[in-house]
């Protein structure tokens, strides 16, 4: 049994970071894999993952971590049995991925303005809670062409459109995901998606 | 039962060595950070170093280059290796296990005395 | 190198009083609460009392509890027992791998 493609993390700089890696055949993950993690510097026994698997020959493991900060970096040992596969580490704020903003909202009352509110995934006390920029997806259900990013550059997390910037009488889609400049993190997965009816008063046209 | 037991203190002329165990039972040295700490007589602790689950080592600064920490997972036995050794190194030898940043377990200690 | 400094460097007591022992770090400790305190006396080996500033190990009696955070802790006492007549270290952890001591507090009986 070997490792094919070694252990790649990412950790959301909170509780948990991912890891996935390929073996060199089908594998079992979670009754033939054990992944023993912990801060290279700690006074502690292991943790230990129990990994899943992701595909055939793919495995993932899910490490639950103390609060993370900067000076982090964790010792990680892969073992078959009492066979050492491969050895590595991992510095969790070099390879950080944020969570997926929640509670996205669409407030359609307010007259002739969209008004798109979501959820900051992490709580007051973590430093990437106010660090975070966002991108918004919004898209048609009827017309795969009108599929539109808007960057969210300041904190709120909220953004503001006129309705007349999309059709009316159709019926629109939107999600939200996170990054953050000061880690240069990946970005995080979309949000759930959100559906509303967009239709608002044409203004009136004389010819 | 899970404990600490050291051994291989004693007697030793300035300038020697010495390797002393430590034989760990009821857990694994190869999931757990496992370190030294020795005491001169009348005196307070001091920390030596440690070696963590993976096998990497931390030392105190004045440690390092005289004293080695190694383990032998087959033996699930903790050694420190100490060279060139001097009077002030005269103390009992403490082998202890981490947990949450500090020493949970403690062995009974062994005694090292450098004299000629 | 990281000093730890306890005070007093010895005290005396009665049974009953209530018994407080600093340490004061010469840098902020690991997350700001990796402090340990251990008991031990004559001829014994240390024995935890409190992990992280303000954990209570598993059978340490509730008379003792930490505080404190960053680079000051203290151990409290809180009803001193005949068995709590011992000298008392405290220990930072950092994120070099270094977990120094402090040079001890010494419990005497008044």
């Known amino acids: 049994m070997k490792v094919l493609q070694e252990p790649t993390c990412v950790s959301d700089y909170m509780s948990i970071s991912t890891c996935e890696w390929k073996m060199n055949g089908p594998t079992n993950c979670s009754t033939e894999l054990r992944l023993l993690y912990q801060l290279v510097f700690l006074l502690s026994e292991a943790h230990t993952c129990i990994p899943e698997n992701n595909g055939g020959a793919g495995c993932v493991c899910h490490l639950l971590m103390d609060d993370v900060v900067s000076a982090d970096n964790y010792t990680l040992d892969l073992w078959a049995g009492q066979q050492l596969l491969w050895k590595g580490s991992f510095k969790p704020s070099e390879h950080v991925k944020p969570r997926a903003p929640g509670n996205l909202t669409v407030h359609t009352n307010v007259s002739d303005t969209l008004l798109l509110t979501w959820s900051n995934p992490y709580p007051p006390d973590n430093y990437l809670y106010n660090h975070l920029t966002y991108a918004v997806n919004i898209w048609s259900e009827n017309d795969p062409a009108d599929f539109r990013i808007y960057n969210v550059t300041y904190l709120e997390p909220s953004l503001r459109i006129a309705a007349s910037t999309l059709k009316s009488g159709i019926s629109y889609r939107a999600r939200v995901r996170a990054w953050a400049q000061c880690y240069n993190t990946t970005w995080s997965e979309w949000s759930p998606s959100t559906k509303w009816h967009n239709s608002y008063r044409e203004p009136f046209e004389q010819h | 039962e899970v404990q600490l037991v050291e051994s291989g203190g004693g007697l030793v002329q300035p300038g020697g060595s010495l390797r002393l165990s430590c034989a760990a039972s009821?857990?694994?040295?190869?999931?757990?950070?496992v370190g030294w700490v020795r005491q001169a007589p009348g005196k307070g602790l001091e920390y030596i170093g440690f070696?963590?689950?993976?096998?990497?080592?931390y030392y105190a600064n004045w440690a390092k280059g005289r004293f080695t920490i190694s383990r032998d997972n087959s033996k699930n036995t903790l050694y420190l290796q100490m060279n060139s050794l001097r009077a002030e190194d005269t103390a009992v030898y403490y082998c202890?296990?981490?947990?949450?940043?500090?020493?949970?377990?403690w062995g009974q200690g062994t005694l090292v005395t450098v004299s000629s | 190198d990281i000093q730890m400094t306890q005070s007093p460097s010895s005290l005396s007591a009665s049974v009953g009083d209530r018994v407080t022992i600093t340490c004061q770090a010469s840098?902020?400790?690991?997350?700001?609460?990796?402090l340990a305190w251990y008991q031990q006396k004559p001829g014994k080996a240390p024995k935890l009392l409190i992990y992280?500033?303000?954990n209570l190990a598993s059978g340490v009696p509730s008379r003792f509890s930490g505080s404190g955070s960053g680079t000051d802790f203290t151990l409290t006492i809180s009803s001193l027992q005949p068995e709590d007549f011992a000298t008392y270290y405290c220990?930072?952890?950092?994120?070099?791998?270094?977990?120094?001591f402090g040079q001890g507090t010494k419990v005497e009986i008044k």
């Open positions: 202890a296990r981490g947990s949450a940043g500090s020493f949970d377990l």
């Open positions: 009821g857990f694994s040295l190869n999931s757990n950070a």
């Open positions: 070696i963590n689950f993976s096998g990497i080592t």
């Open positions: 840098e902020s400790v690991y997350k700001n609460n990796y």
């Open positions: 992280r500033a303000s």
């Open positions: 220990q930072g952890g950092y994120s070099s791998g270094m977990y120094p």
